[in-house]
């Protein structure tokens, strides 16, 4: 039985040209995390963090994606096209797969505030 829950940074906004941290956290389970996948709204994989192999950033995102902090992901040099949904998928033993959702809005405004709060999606 899957007892865990994924907490995410929820709906966040950030300035064009700036950076943002995408963060998910798995709680309420003793399952062991073996891999975390990060994917974009169009289901393209940004990065994978495998327990044994470490991080793999996909070539299309190599210049703009940095691993971490932790199991999270940092998106840099944001463009308006980065607006949309992002998903973290936690592969765990023995529970199976947990999935969290984050919505990122990239704002043109130079006064846009970076807001982030943890919430259960």
């Amino acid at each position: 039985m899957m007892t865990g829950t994924i907490e995410t940074t929820g709906n966040i906004s950030a300035k064009k040209g700036g950076s943002v941290i995408l963060q998910c956290h798995l709680s309420s389970t003793m399952a062991q995390v073996t891999q975390v996948n990060w994917e974009q709204h169009d289901h393209s994989l940004l990065a994978i963090r495998n327990a044994e192999l470490g991080w793999h950033i996909y070539p299309a995102f190599k210049d703009r994606v940095a691993p971490g902090p932790g199991l999270g992901l940092t998106l840099q040099s944001l463009t308006m096209n980065d607006t949309g949904e992002y998903f973290c998928t936690y592969h765990t033993y023995p529970d199976g797969t947990y999935r969290g959702r984050i919505f990122l809005e990239v704002l043109e405004s130079s006064v846009a505030e970076h807001s982030a709060r943890f919430q259960i999606p």
Epitope: M1, A31, Q32, T34, Q35, H91, P94, D95, G96
Partner: antibody, heavy 120, light 107 residues
Framework: EVQLVQSGSELKKPGASVKVSCKAS????????MNWVRQAPGRGLEWMGW????????AYAQDFTERFVFSLDTSVTTAYLQISSLKAEDTAVYYC?????????????WGQGTLVTVSS | DIQLTQSPSFLSASVGDRVTITCRAS??????LAWYQQKPGKAPRVLIY???TLQSGVPSRFSGSESGTEFTLTISSLQPEDLATYYC?????????FGQGTKVEIK
């Protein structure tokens, strides 16, 4: 080369305790969950439970909640199974087995097994 | 808990025969099933995982298939070294469990 090497056979009296070790080499112990499996003489395989090698938290199958303890010493890359208040019916071969971290979690490497005999 | 029922518990076949072992799950487990071979006095070794994926180094005469909650291990041409007991295992969620085993004897 990945290897799980278990401690040798044990002969114990009823009521005694035993600690079986499983030394992992050729990979990072803390990256792969570790399972324990029991096989009584002439019987099939019984999954006893597993230990989260990242946090050290154990989880036990229903028949193994009372006298069985899984533990780790990451400094010597070793997993342990301790059985207390031994009974004759604990006589079995005990295996440690590593969980593969593919998406389906089969047991890809096994120790050679440790025979524990409980007899007065 | 999900139960696995393995059949037959024993079979005797000749070298070169096609051998089939079945494992039925009491509920759907998707492809979360593995097959293991255990030779006398030895530890088990994985043959098939994910219901159909052949473990590296395992001879191609071994194959796995699934149909709903029924899983099959096939040995296309039995060899003398295949004398062993074969187990299926459910891999998804706690608790894991094994089938009762199928002992394969060479005639």
């Amino acid at each position: 080369e990945v290897q799980l090497v278990q401690s040798g056979s044990e002969l114990k009296k009823p009521g005694a305790s035993v600690k079986v070790s499983c030394k992992a080499s050729g990979y990072t112990l803390t990256n792969y969950p570790m399972n324990w499996v029991r096989q009584a003489p002439g019987r099939g395989l019984e999954w006893m439970g597993w230990i989260n090698t990242n946090t050290g938290s154990p989880a036990y199958a229903q028949d193994f909640t009372e006298r069985f303890v899984f533990s780790l010493d990451t400094s010597v890359t070793t997993a342990y199974l301790q059985i207390s208040s031994l009974k004759a019916e604990d006589t079995a071969v005990y295996y440690c087995a590593r969980t593969a971290i593919t998406s389906v979690y089969h047991f890809d490497y096994w120790g050679q097994g440790t025979l524990v005999t409980v007899s007065s | 808990d999900i139960q696995l029922t393995q059949s037959p518990s024993f079979l005797s076949a000749s070298v070169g025969d096609r051998v089939t072992i079945t494992c039925r799950a009491s509920q759907g487990i998707s492809s979360y099933l593995a097959w293991y071979q255990q030779k006398p006095g030895k530890a088990p070794r994985v043959l098939i995982y994910g219901a159909t994926t052949l473990q590296s180094g395992v001879p191609s005469r071994f194959s796995g298939s699934e149909s709903g909650t029924e899983f099959t291990l096939t040995i296309s041409s039995l060899q003398p070294e295949d004398l062993a007991t074969y187990y299926c295992q459910k891999l998804n969620s706690h608790p894991s469990s094994f089938g009762q085993g199928t002992k394969v004897e060479i005639k």
